[in-house]
């Protein structure tokens, strides 16, 4: 058993049928010695008396808010949460496996640049009685500071019969140098509590591996005289690290017909313009990627050919 | 991903082309190592990230773009002295900081070259003959060093009398390649920045 926060405790249980559970001793936070009784949640049934209460915690029915009273007055509370270990592996009931980039990916994180700011998000089908708390650091032994905000509900989607909820959090490394070569990964730890179930999820990454630039901005077409060709131009996104000559991007320019089946023409360039043939009803799209370290491509920025 | 190969303009900063080739070569070598050594811990998540140049050179600090020198987090610089007669710079562009930066890059390349050659000698003794260093990568390191053209004492190749532990050598190869790729990215960024200046 360990303390998650004041008056909230997590009991770790080897979870299998007929398991013996864990013996837990609760102590009433009071100078009083006599006339103390204990109850669980809203029930008025007295579980025991005295300054300490010994319980055998086996199932969720044994978890909850234990209260010690004296003469109708509440003295203190202890909330017990359960953390299930199933065959040596901590349970992951609360969050959905996003399966990207690989199986057992519960937290996904992205950064728009090298400033040390990043966003993480996760999915759940649970809509109520759910709380998250996020901590982060650079490295785990002798950790360096990363400050995270509060996790917020950022999207709701309908998936088949189920509703899916997306939560996200923004974090900022306290003293980040965009040019630094990372040798210790960022660690992100999310505590999730659903009703009386506690779970924790972690992710470990280098900022360089989670970079996904914003799409190029100011995408424009300039027809070339007496030609079906157009000059496409664009700019680096505002959110990208500067100077751009140091943090350079490479670009992919795509000409796509109205039908998805039509052949796509693709050109790769390090410049911020390209000459392409604009077909009728086609659209031109441009996306960006770090020129020197192949992390994710940005989403496409698009303009119609007409 | 296949990038179009850039052909440098005659007036272009001479080292840019070499640094691009270096990054391409080390990335290909790392990919090959990860595929060949699939049963070894060779992924970024599994290896210890060690920098053999740590406390010996300070390339990131010495080559920091001017725009980032205002960022206090970038300025935990280490005092290091370098030889300062590089040929990548046209003499009118030579500045002490730039020379310091380029000589730091040269020292990095020299250290990695020694490590890779020592390692290759060990790998050639492996009865499994599982993996060797790409000669193209070693050649590209050499080309960039020649383009930088710094006078520096030659570092003797490390020789080891004891029987090599091939498992450890292959894991060390992965560690070295990951670190060298990160340094090659920095070198490419620096060359691109200097070329634009």
């Amino acid at each position: 058993i360990w303390e998650l926060k004041k008056d909230v405790y997590v009991v770790e249980l080897d979870w299998y049928p007929d398991a013996p559970g864990e013996m837990v001793v609760l102590t009433c936070d009071t100078p009083e010695e006599d006339g103390i009784t204990w109850t669980l949640d809203q029930s008025s049934e007295v579980l025991g008396s005295g300054k300490t209460l010994t319980i055998q915690v086996k199932e969720f029915g044994d978890a909850g808010q234990y209260t010690c009273h004296k003469g109708g007055e509440v003295l203190s509370h202890s909330l017990l949460l359960l953390h299930k270990k199933e065959d040596g592996i901590w349970s992951t009931d609360i969050l959905k496996d996003q399966k990207e980039p690989k199986n057992k990916t519960f937290l996904r994180c992205e950064a728009k640049n090298y400033s040390g700011r990043f966003t993480c998000w996760w999915l759940t089908t649970i809509s109520t009685d759910l709380t998250f708390s996020v901590k982060s650091s650079r490295g785990s032994s002798d950790p360096q500071g990363v400050t995270c905000g509060a996790a917020t509900l950022s999207a709701e989607r309908v998936r088949g019969d189920n509703k899916e909820y997306e939560y996200s959090v923004e974090c900022q490394e306290d003293s980040a140098c965009p040019a630094a070569e990372e040798s210790l990964p960022i660690e992100v730890m999310v505590d999730a509590v659903h009703k009386l179930k506690y779970e924790n999820y972690t992710s470990s990454f280098f900022i360089r591996d989670i970079i996904k630039p914003d799409p190029p901005k100011n995408l424009q077409l300039k027809p070339l005289k007496n030609s079906r060709q157009v000059e496409v131009s664009w700019e680096y996104p505002d959110t990208w690290s500067t100077p751009h000559s140091y943090f350079s991007l490479t670009f992919c320019v795509q000409v796509q017909g109205k039908s998805k089946r039509e052949k796509k023409d693709r050109v790769f360039t390090d410049k911020t313009s390209a000459t392409v043939i604009c077909r009728k009803n086609a659209s031109i799209s441009v996306r960006a990627q770090d020129r020197y370290y192949s992390s994710s491509w940005s989403e496409w920025a698009s303009v119609p050919c007409s | 991903r296949n990038l179009p190969v850039a052909t440098p303009d005659p007036g272009m900063f001479p080292c840019l082309h070499h640094s691009q080739n270096l990054l391409r070569a080390v990335s290909n070598m790392l990919q090959k190592a990860r595929q060949t050594l699939e049963f070894y811990p060779c992924t970024s998540e599994e290896i210890d990230h060690e920098d053999i140049t740590k406390d010996k050179t300070s390339t990131v600090e010495a080559c920091l773009p001017l725009e980032l020198t205002k960022n206090e987090s970038c300025l935990n610089s280490r005092e290091t002295s370098f030889i300062t007669n590089g040929s990548c710079l046209a003499s009118r562009k030579t500045s002490f900081m730039m020379a310091l930066c380029l000589s730091s890059i040269y020292e990095d390349l020299k250290m990695y070259q020694v490590e890779f050659k020592t390692m290759n000698a060990k790998l050639l003794m492996d009865p499994k003959r599982q993996i060797f260093l790409d000669q193209n990568m070693l050649a590209v390191i050499d080309e960039l060093m020649q383009a930088l053209n710094f006078n520096s004492e030659t570092v003797p190749q490390k020789s080891s009398l004891e029987e090599p532990d091939f498992y450890k050598t292959k894991i060390k190869l992965c560690i070295l390649l990951h670190a060298f790729r990160i340094r090659a990215v920095t070198i490419d960024r620096v060359m691109s920045y200097l070329n634009a200046s």
Epitope: W15, Y16, D18, E86, D87, G88, I89, D93, K104 | -
Partner: antibody
Amino acid sequence: QVQLVQSGGGVVQPGRSLRLSCAASGFTFSSYGMHWVRQAPGKGLEWVAFIRYDGSNKYYADSVKGRFTISRDNSKNTLYLQMKSLRAEDTAVYYCKTHGSHDNWGQGTMVTVSS
Amino acid sequence: SYVLTQPPSVSGTPGQRVTISCSGGRSNIGKNTVKWYQQLPGTAPKLLIYGNDQRPSGVPDRFSGSKSGTSASLAITGVQAEDEADYYCQSYDRGTHPALLFGTGTKVTVLG
């Protein structure tokens, strides 16, 4: 004490269907994940499928994906394996088993796929 | 489809020490715990070892398990006639959990 009693096995022709049941008692069935494991005659153990305690997630071996469906009725304390498009290579003893560091197995039920 | 490799058979005379190896990889045994089962002819498997080296109550202390890196082993010190059976190791793979990964199985024969 924990008990898992299986039923539903038998002889079936290739391409036909069969449903296996596993009745649980002696524990809070709705709190635990459950597996199906099979063993072809003279061969080793092969995992078939898993279902979470609340039925929300199901996982299958590639060899049965799209043909077998694992399900549970927590109100009846019963686990099921619906097997469709059966093949000769599905011939095996099928076991249900609880998920956890200490596990409990059903007695097994023989499924023979033969024309 | 078996990722965990065991020797097909091992044998020993009563009282001898018999060991069975179970060889896996970094993503399964390297990352997760190992169980061992004993299966007597015509019966369901019985748990002998969980959590690499833990014995459930009721299992004789002549059975012991260990794990090192990407391999595990089961030792029977002072093998007895009633130990003649098939033995299976089991673990999980990081990417496919909760799918059970079973070893190929080892037939233990007690001679004489």
